[in-house]
């Protein structure tokens, strides 16, 4: 499989509302015009697919309606946002990029971004 370098940040801290954003950048060896981006989560040696989207250059990056991911693309960068995260979702989130068209097909897998999610402390009841 023709390999391609994919870069992503090592660590990201999710916001108090459970939102984490990071950039996934790929070094396109050719003239990529259709790209598929998949976010994988690795935890306890198990890998699961979080979300995926295929987009044409110049077109919007659209995930399925019920996806927890949103994103935008600019050149060889994809800005990914994952929402609705809780402490139990802490883990390594890997960016996988496939250059689908034109041929030849290229595949690149990042080293992963460790996303830390801290559930907010519940507000204490106030007694007056």
């Amino acid at each position: 499989c023709k390999a391609m370098h994919v870069a992503q940040p090592a660590v990201v801290l999710a916001s108090s509302r459970g939102i984490a954003s990071f950039v996934c950048e790929y070094a396109s060896p050719g003239k990529a015009t259709e790209v598929r981006v998949t976010v994988l989560r690795q935890a306890d040696s198990q890998v699961t697919e979080v979300c995926a989207a295929t987009y044409m250059m110049g077109n919007e990056l659209t995930f399925l309606d019920d996806s927890i991911c949103t994103g935008t693309s600019s050149g060889n960068q994809v800005n990914l946002t994952i929402q609705g995260l809780r402490a139990m979702d802490t883990g390594l989130y890997i960016c996988k990029v496939e250059l689908m068209y034109p041929p030849p097909y290229y595949l690149g897998i990042g080293n992963g971004t460790q996303i830390y999610v801290i559930d907010p402390e519940p507000c204490p009841d106030s007694d007056f």
């Epitope: 250059m57 689908m100 030849p104």
Partner: antibody, heavy 120, light 112 residues
């Protein structure tokens, strides 16, 4: 239903240029690449190139570089191919075709073809 | 460029009988991602080409199941289990593994 309707037959003189159109309907124009294919009289098929309707980005067969220029007008869902410096061996039927990602970028819908005849 | 070679050039078939068309590529079309980038198109007389098969063995929407395709990385076969009159035309194999996309020279299927 999906349709690609091409402009009519052209008779042109050697050395001249011609611009063929391909009007798409029945789907979102910017969601699919458009390819162009040449068919010489009684012969097989030759891929000329493709265009991304979103940004006008093209990929082309080196054999046709300097011969064919591909463009789009998103506002009217139309793709164009201009052929320059025409010679007798450019006489052929030219097809536009839509690529479909679900079919791993096969050409799933084709225009009816435009016959270009180069004759003095 | 990848060269696609088809045989035979012409194939006369009796209706109801099976037919087989061969296609050979100058380079393996089986990618390490598991996909074989081989396609079959049919051009009926006086018409534009139409897609029959994608990814070597998958039938496009609306294609009758009497059509099937199989092969290795470089040798492919399109089979029609029982030829019907509407199957006449020129069959082309094509590759989409790398640019430029290339087609075979075509096989003309005709009714005896």
């Amino acid at each position: 239903q999906v349709q690609l309707v091409q402009s009519g037959a052209e008779v042109v003189k050697p050395g001249a240029s011609v611009k063929i159109s391909c009007k798409a309907s029945g789907y979102k124009f910017t969601d699919h690449f458009i390819n162009w294919v040449k068919q010489n009289p009684g012969q097989g098929l030759e891929w000329i190139g493709d265009i991304n309707p979103n940004n006008g980005g093209t990929n082309s067969n080196q054999k046709f570089e300097g011969k064919a220029t591909l463009t789009v007008d998103k506002s009217i869902s139309t793709a164009y191919m201009e052929l320059r410096r025409l010679r007798s061996d450019d006489t052929a039927v030219y097809y536009c075709a839509r690529l479909r990602r679900e079919y791993f970028y096969a050409m799933d819908y084709w225009g009816q073809g435009t016959l270009v005849t180069v004759s003095s | 460029d990848i060269v696609m070679t088809q045989s035979p050039l012409s194939l006369p078939v009796t209706p109801g009988e099976p037919a087989s068309i061969s296609c050979r590529s100058s380079k393996s079309l089986l990618h390490s991602n598991g996909i074989t980038y081989l396609y079959w198109y049919l051009q009926k007389p006086g018409q534009s080409p139409q897609l029959l098969i994608y990814q070597m063995s998958n039938l496009a929407s609306g294609v009758p199941d009497r059509f099937s395709s199989s092969g290795s990385g470089t040798d492919f076969t399109l089979k029609i289990s029982r030829v019907e009159a509407e199957d006449v035309g020129v069959y082309y194999c094509a590759q989409n593994l790398e640019l430029p996309l290339t087609f075979g020279g075509g096989t003309k299927l005709e009714i005896k």
